[in-house]
Interface confidence: medium
Amino acid sequence: PLATIPVSTTSLTSSEGSTISTPSVDISTPVTTSIVGDQCSRCKNGGFWDGLKCQCLTPYYGESCEEVVNSIDIAPPETVSAQMELTVTVTSVKFTDELKNHSSQEFREFNKTFTEQMNIVYSGIPEYVGVNITNLRLGSVVVEHDVLLRTKYTPEYKTALDNATEVVKQKITKVTTEQIMTNDNCSALMCFNTTGTQVQNITVTQYDPVEECRQKAEEYEDYFLVEYRDQKPYCISPCESGFNASKNCNHGKCQMSQNGARCLCVTTETHWYSGEDCNQGTQKSHHHHHH
């Protein structure tokens, strides 16, 4: 097949000083190149030919997968969660073997009352999702259960969940201290043994946008970074415009290389541009020098 190569009239000079200029070709003349042999060889950086075009691997793009993207999609979860493994001792219910059977009417009734009691206890914690009884054992009833917490993903999600787990601890400690049997009578929905309250374990969702960004950037990991916009993380190179870390190439184009971002400076009809940020303009002489 024949591929038409578009020809640019603008020449680009790298900020290191080497000129990268396109051949001076009459723009009206189409330049074609014949591509023969193995099509796979034209796809660089691990890309593969799908019969029509190169399918590039992240972070590459372009006809031959030779260019590096300015931003990489990273997708944090919509919500993040925490699970707290707790134990409390309920004194207002007598333990029976039926409570071990999660299908029994006794267990179901206990589960309903316990769930309702915890709904009341954790009322006011926005992250609270619910409780799940994992085991009941003798003593009166020792309740091993999970408290489930969930919140929307934000950069501060760990702090939000850590704070919520602290409030859970405070609230369960308070209720198991206050709701106790008096003269073998429980005036609340449930009564507890103050000393039977323990937090066994806390598991929090782990998500690190910086780590995901670095992994996806592969050998460019040192040059891609995460910036936030509207609480959403973006994995960008300095060549992506509109961020704090964006490189301003002024009269030039930002391009990624394995040494980082560099500016390719343009040469116009009237000026040459140079410098690291292509901000130094030199007016072309009006005289033509013949060699």
């Epitope: 179901r108 309903k112 709904n119 009322s123 926005p126």
Partner: antibody, heavy 121, light 108 residues
Framework: QVQLVESGGGVVQPGRSLRLSCAAS????????MHWVRQAPGKCLEWVAG????????YYAEAVKGRFTISRDTSKNTLYLQMNSLRAEDTAVYYC??????????????WGQGTLVTVSS | SYELTQSPSVSVSPGQTASITCSGD??????TSWYQQKPGQSPVLVIY???KRPSGIPERFSGSNSGNTATLTISGTQAMDEADYYC??????????FGCGTKLTVLR
């Protein structure tokens, strides 16, 4: 004493919008989840939407999801229901009801007097 | 979706006991509330947590809930108890669901 007073009802054409308000007094508004429940003329009670005390969680009945929005303004002790794309089947008396806990997971211990919404062309 | 089923009407003579039932799949696993609604008025909570009475509700109102059925019992029914009664359940799987109401008629 606890008082819930709804307002904002009226006659509206299908496809149009309406916003209901519920002014709460006699209790600490920020300590309770709040709900909207409706009742079509001569029909059953139907739960519409609920909101936690701090507005962190909002729940909607399938029939109104995507069209209605529940919200609250603690500084004004007021609950709202923004109703968009109204349909004839939304015609009902709309009650505002207080949940017993800050989360909505509870029964409704106090109700307002209701406001009638009629959707008709 | 979860449904609660109530019989449309129940009639009782004054002083007798009225039983109003509400059924739903594994309803006993959920807490049930009961609301009384008189014509032209707002609903009033009469029973919560299956069997608890809010302050101000007479002792003749009682509730139970097990298996698939919750029951509201009014003992020594009075003429003033004539109303529609709605059962309601809630949990994370069902959200907030009402039965379609039972009209209690106190025979003259």
């Amino acid at each position: 004493q606890v008082q819930l007073v709804e307002s904002g009802g009226g006659v509206v054409q299908p496809g149009r919008s309406l916003r209901l308000s519920c002014a709460a007094s006699g209790f600490t508004f920020s300590n309770h989840g709040m709900h909207w429940v409706r009742q079509a003329p001569g029909k059953c009670l139907e739960w519409v939407a609920g909101i936690w005390s701090d507005a962190s969680n909002k729940y909607y009945a399938e029939a109104v999801k995507g069209r209605f929005t529940i919200s609250r303004d603690t500084s004004k002790n007021t609950l709202y229901l923004q109703m968009n794309s109204l349909r004839a089947e939304d015609t009902a008396v709309y009650y505002c009801a207080r949940a017993t806990y800050t989360t909505g997971w509870s029964y409704f211990d106090y109700w307002g007097q209701g406001t009638l919404v009629t959707v008709s062309s | 979706s979860y449904e609660l089923t109530q019989s449309p009407s129940v009639s009782v003579s004054p002083g007798q006991t009225a039983s109003i039932t509400c059924s739903g799949d594994k309803l006993g696993d959920k807490y049930t509330s009961w609301y009384q609604q008189k014509p032209g008025q707002s609903p009033v909570l009469v029973i919560y947590h299956d069997r608890k009475r809010p302050s101000g509700i007479p002792e003749r109102f009682s509730g139970s809930n097990s298996g698939n059925t919750a029951t509201l019992t009014i003992s020594g029914t009075q003429a003033m108890d004539e109303a529609d009664y709605y059962c309601q359940a809630y949990d994370r799987s069902t959200a907030w669901v009402f039965g379609c109401g039972t009209k209690l008629t106190v025979l003259r």
